[in-house]
Structures are given as C-alpha cells and as structure tokens.
C-alpha cells in the first residue's frame, strides 16, 4: 500500500457489496488496531484499476476473510 | 436513474468563498460516500473532501484542510463543500461523486472505476489573483 497516516481508518464508507472474482488481483485484510476499530478488506484490481474496500459483512468479504485465516493459522 | 447535480461553481478573487451543492438522487444514500473531487487543466482528478453518510466519516486533501467544509443534509440527498479562503491554485472543475469502496490513500490521483462510481457534471471553479 502507500502510506498511511496513522490514527484512521483506510475505507471512506461501507464498501462495496462484491467485486467479481476474475478483477481480483489480490485481498488484504486489516484487522481492529488503534488506527482503526473495525475490520477492513481491500481489494487490489487487475489492470491497475486501483484498490477499493470490500463491505467486511458482505458474503463475499466473509469468505475472503476465512479463506485468509485458514491460509494463515 | 442516478443523477448528481452540481451547482455553486464561478468566478472568485483569491481569498474569497463559495459553497458548492451537489443534489444526488436515483440511489440509496448511505450506502455510498459521497465527495468532490477536481480536475485542473492537465492535471490528474483528485480526491478533494469526501463524506461517508452513514457514519459521518470525513475526509480532506492536505491542501484544503482548515478552508474547506464538506456536510450533508441526508433529508434533502444533498452534499455540500463550503470553500473559503480559496487560492489561484484551487482553480478547476469540480465533480460531485457518490462511490463505494474508496480507499482514502489513493484519492490523491483517484482512479474512477464505472461499475462502482457515478458522477455528476461538474462545475467549473476560477480563483483568480
């Protein structure tokens, strides 16, 4: 990511609903810290189209989200 | 049909104020964020202030922090980005945007994606010296 300045969250808004799989170039969770208390998902986009923020309740963040904790624990 | 309707754009001397609106319609509120961004001549289209309305949440590019405004008026659908202290340098067309998913790191050369991104015309702003 570029940088961030500490002490905020990086989503502005809930986030988007879903992203089609086949834009997905790759998903980063954020866990609650003290820059942020909630949970964040972010989607980088094929084709440099940029990043956006997956909605964390949406169905599809939820399996992102345990796809990653599986992956990692 | 969404439809974001800009308005308060004109001719100011440095130092003066304007307060642009932005009515928005055809789409649910909260589930956007709602913001203006600006586009000066052969210049990348920038995030300027942007506000989330289901929370409230704010956002501001360093260069207008402490001059500029942004508030909402959830009855009316309506954004507003009240502008003081403008400078020659905030001369540009400003667009009304409602999106989701923005990521605040990258709105400093903000990439507009179709499918999760609407716009308004836009309404030019001239700060002269």
């Known amino acids: 990511f570029p940088m961030f300045k500490r002490g905020r969250c990086l989503c502005i808004g809930p986030g988007v609903k879903a992203v089609k799989v086949a834009d997905i170039e790759k998903a980063s969770i954020m866990y609650p810290s003290n820059n942020c208390d909630k949970i964040e998902v972010i989607i980088t986009l094929k084709e440099n189209k940029g990043q956006r923020c997956l909605n964390p309740k949406s169905k599809q963040a939820r399996l992102i989200i345990k796809k990653v904790e599986r992956k990692n624990f | 049909e969404v439809q974001l309707v800009e308005s308060g754009g004109g001719l100011v001397q440095a130092g003066g104020s304007l307060r642009l609106s932005c009515a928005a319609s055809?789409?649910?509120?909260?589930?956007?964020?709602i913001g203006w961004f600006r586009q000066a001549p052969g210049k990348e289209r920038e995030g300027v202030s942007i506000?989330?309305?289901?929370?409230?949440?704010?956002y501001y590019a360093d260069s207008v922090k402490g001059r500029f405004t942004i508030s909402t008026d959830n009855a009316k659908n309506t954004v507003y980005l009240q502008m003081n202290s403008l400078k020659p340098e905030d001369t540009a067309v400003y667009y009304c945007?409602?999106?989701?998913?923005?990521?605040?790191?990258?709105?400093?050369?903000?990439?507009?994606?179709?499918?999760?991104?609407?716009w308004g015309q836009g309404t030019q702003v001239t700060v002269s010296s």
């Open positions: 055809g789409f649910t509120f909260d589930d956007y964020a």
């Open positions: 945007a409602a999106g989701q998913g923005w990521v605040i790191a990258t709105m400093t050369s903000f990439r507009a994606h179709r499918e999760y991104d609407y």
């Open positions: 506000i989330s309305s289901s929370d409230g949440t704010t």
